[in-house]
C-alpha cells in the first residue's frame, strides 16, 4: 500500500490522543533505555509503511501484535485517513479469530513495540533531518 495520500495531520492527532498511550501501556514496566532503535524512516509515507509492517506482519519471536489495542486503533485510523487502505487485506488479522486466553508478552514483542514508538515519534517530526 502507498501511504502518500494519507491525511498525516489527522493520523498524528490520533496517535497523540490515543495510540501513544496504548503503546506506553504495552511497554509498562520496561525501561526506555532497554532497547536500541534499529528501525528508521525518512518521511511520513515511509514511516507509515514501517509502522504497518511492524504492527501487522508476524515476525520471529513475536507472532502477532495485531490483536493489541494500539494495533486495532492504528488500523482504524489508517482505514479512515488513508484512501483505499481498507481494501488491503491484513493477513495477521485472521489469526485474531482464535485468541489465546493467557496473554504472553515476549521480550521480542517488547523490542518490536519499542521500535514502533520510535517510528511514531519520527512520523510526528517530519521536518527533522535524518540522523
Amino acid at each position: 500500500y502507498d501511504f502518500t495520500n494519507c491525511d498525516f495531520e489527522k493520523i498524528k492527532a490520533a496517535y497523540l490522543s490515543t495510540i501513544s498511550k496504548d503503546l506506553i501501556t504495552y511497554m509498562s514496566g520496561t525501561k526506555s533505555t532497554e532497547f536500541n532503535n534499529t528501525v528508521s524512516c525518512s518521511n511520513r509515507p515511509h514511516c507509515l509503511t514501517e509502522i504497518q509492517s511492524l504492527t501487522f506482519n508476524p515476525t520471529a519471536g513475536c507472532a502477532s501484535l495485531a490483536k493489541e489495542m494500539f494495533a486495532m486503533k492504528t488500523k482504524a485510523a489508517l482505514a479512515i485517513w488513508c484512501p483505499g487502505y481498507s481494501e488491503t487485506q491484513i493477513n495477521a488479522t485472521q489469526a485474531m479469530k482464535k485468541r489465546r486466553k493467557r496473554k504472553v508478552t515476549t521480550n521480542k514483542c517488547l523490542e518490536q513495540v519499542s521500535q514502533l514508538q520510535g517510528l511514531w515519534r519520527r512520523f510526528n517530526r517530519p521536518l527533522l533531518k535524518q540522523q
Epitope: F56, M72, K73, A76, A79, S86, I90, M96
Partner: nanobody, 111 residues
Framework: EVQLVESGGGLVQPGGSLRLSCAAS????????MGWFRQAPGKEREGVAT??????YYADSVKGRFTISADNSKNTAYLQMNSLKPEDTAVYYC??????WGQGTLVTVSS
C-alpha cells in the same frame, strides 16, 4: 459462517436521520477494528467512521452528524446518521477492517 450483514438503509429526505446496523456472525466483533465505508455512484469507496476499543474516528464530511458505536453483547455495530444531505447518498458497507466486508445497504437522500 463468518459474515457481516448490514441493514437500515432506505430513502430519507434531506435533514432526516437513519440508523444502520451491522450484525456480525462467526466471530467476536469486539476483537476487531470495525468501520463504515461508503461508495457513491462513479466514486471510490471511502471511509466514513471507524471504531476500535471504544475509540472512534470520523471523516471530516460526516463529523458531528454521524456516530459510530458497537454493542459487543449483541455483536453488532451501528452508524447513526443525522442531518443527512443529498451527497450522503451511497451504498454503505460495514467492515472488520482488513478482513471481512458486508454486502452493503443503499442510502438515498432525496426530496
Amino acid at each position: 459462517e463468518v459474515q457481516l450483514v448490514e441493514s437500515g438503509g432506505g430513502l430519507v429526505q434531506p435533514g432526516g436521520s437513519l440508523r444502520l446496523s451491522c450484525a456480525a456472525s462467526g466471530f467476536k466483533l469486539g476483537y476487531y477494528a470495525m468501520g463504515w465505508f461508503r461508495q457513491a455512484p462513479g466514486k471510490e469507496r471511502e471511509g466514513v467512521a471507524t471504531i476500535a476499543g471504544g475509540t472512534t474516528y470520523y471523516a471530516d464530511s460526516v463529523k458531528g452528524r454521524f456516530t459510530i458505536s458497537a454493542d459487543n453483547s449483541k455483536n453488532t455495530a451501528y452508524l447513526q446518521m443525522n442531518s443527512l444531505k443529498p451527497e450522503d447518498t451511497a451504498v454503505y458497507y460495514c467492515a472488520a477492517i482488513g478482513w471481512r466486508w458486508g454486502q452493503g445497504t443503499l442510502v438515498t437522500v432525496s426530496s
